[in-house]
């Protein structure tokens, strides 16, 4: 029969696991919110009739189903910041692109872990910044919906 000490340690483990899952859920929701915020600003940019933002190419993973695939998002944060930096001077109301991207990067690292040995396999087909953001928003939504509550 399990001793009271082993029962309490397994309960503690279960609690810790539940806590980790809750944190993971929070980080995913934070990432989702940040990406949606960026996309809505892009859509606003579209309404300002400034289509040259769509000349920039972004790369998406061949397939993204796990948190480790967020490495592919992290790899593209530099180019994303470049686009935001360039567009800030043209009615793109994002106060601090560097800070915004930095926050996304921190959230991504928390979710995928700091191990950078996983090499992303990018799709040959490139995407516009709008499609890039939409794809990662869909990824977050998919992981959130399949996570145990």
């Amino acid at each position: 029969a399990p001793t009271s000490s082993s029962t309490s340690s397994s309960t503690a483990e279960a609690q810790q696991q539940q806590q980790q899952q809750q944190q993971q859920q929070q980080h995913l929701e934070q990432l989702l919110m940040d990406l949606q915020e960026l996309l809505s600003r892009m859509e606003n940019y579209r309404n300002l009739k400034l289509p040259r933002m769509l000349t920039f190419k972004f790369y998406l993973p061949k397939q993204a189903t796990e948190l480790k695939d967020l490495q592919c998002l992290e790899d593209e944060l530099g180019p994303l910041r470049h686009v935001l930096d360039l567009t800030q001077s043209k009615s793109f109301q994002l106060e601090d692109a560097e800070n915004f991207i930095s926050n996304i990067r921190v959230t991504v690292v928390k979710l995928k872990g700091s191990d950078n040995t996983f090499e992303c396999q990018f799709d040959d087909e490139s995407a516009t910044v709008v499609d890039f953001l939409r794809r990662w928003i869909a990824f977050c939504q998919s992981i959130i919906s399949t996570s145990p509550q």
Epitope: R46, L48, K49, L50, P51, R52, M53, L54, T55, F56, K57, P79, H82, V83, L86, K90, S91, E125, S126, T128, V130, D131, R134
Partner: antibody, heavy 126, light 108 residues
Amino acid sequence: QVQLVQSGAEVKKPGASVKVSCKASGYTFTSYGISWVRQAPGQGLEWMGWISAYNGNTNYAQKLQGRVTMTTDTSTSTAYMELRSLRSDDTAVYYCAREGAIYYDSSGYYFPFDYWGQGTLVTVSS
Amino acid sequence: SYELTQPPSVSVSPGQTARITCSGDALPRKFAYWYQQKSGQAPVMVIYGDSKRPPGIPERFSGSSSGTMATLTITGAQVEDEADYYCYSTDSGGDVSVFGGGTKLTVL
């Protein structure tokens, strides 16, 4: 249907200025930009610059900076390109072209120069 | 200033595949566009966003891009495809546009 109608041919002396107009019809003028492209006789296409008909933002080719000015008059849906201090190597056909984006399946793509004016021949000769 | 480099001329026989290349340092991060210009006419877009065909452009026209090189391919070139072809893109900042020097396609 979309049309860009340009002003007629011009003959100018070196050092003079020329102003070419481009009247747009068949679409919402302020939803697009206008680029100006020129082509010297027997030569390739050269992008000169771009103006947003929405807010008047401009970007000019580096080599023409200081000599070219692009403007729009939204009340008449007309774009203008003025080139100053003309030289003989400015002899060319000058085109205006619509520049914007297309949206379908909720995706957007930059869609430059889907409609062009008929071209305006500017001859610079002493 | 930013440049796009194209071969001055390409020749193919009718029915053959013509490939016209365009190289530029910013192309890994910028989409390429292709225009066809026949003698005495304004240019016509045949490819946008590296590989997409505008409505009305025949299926034999296709585009691709890899690294610093974009390619326009005409599969089964026809005599009426004889024209000058220009690639077009924007610099790494996105504000300044540039055309390649143009390629004269001859379909003999």
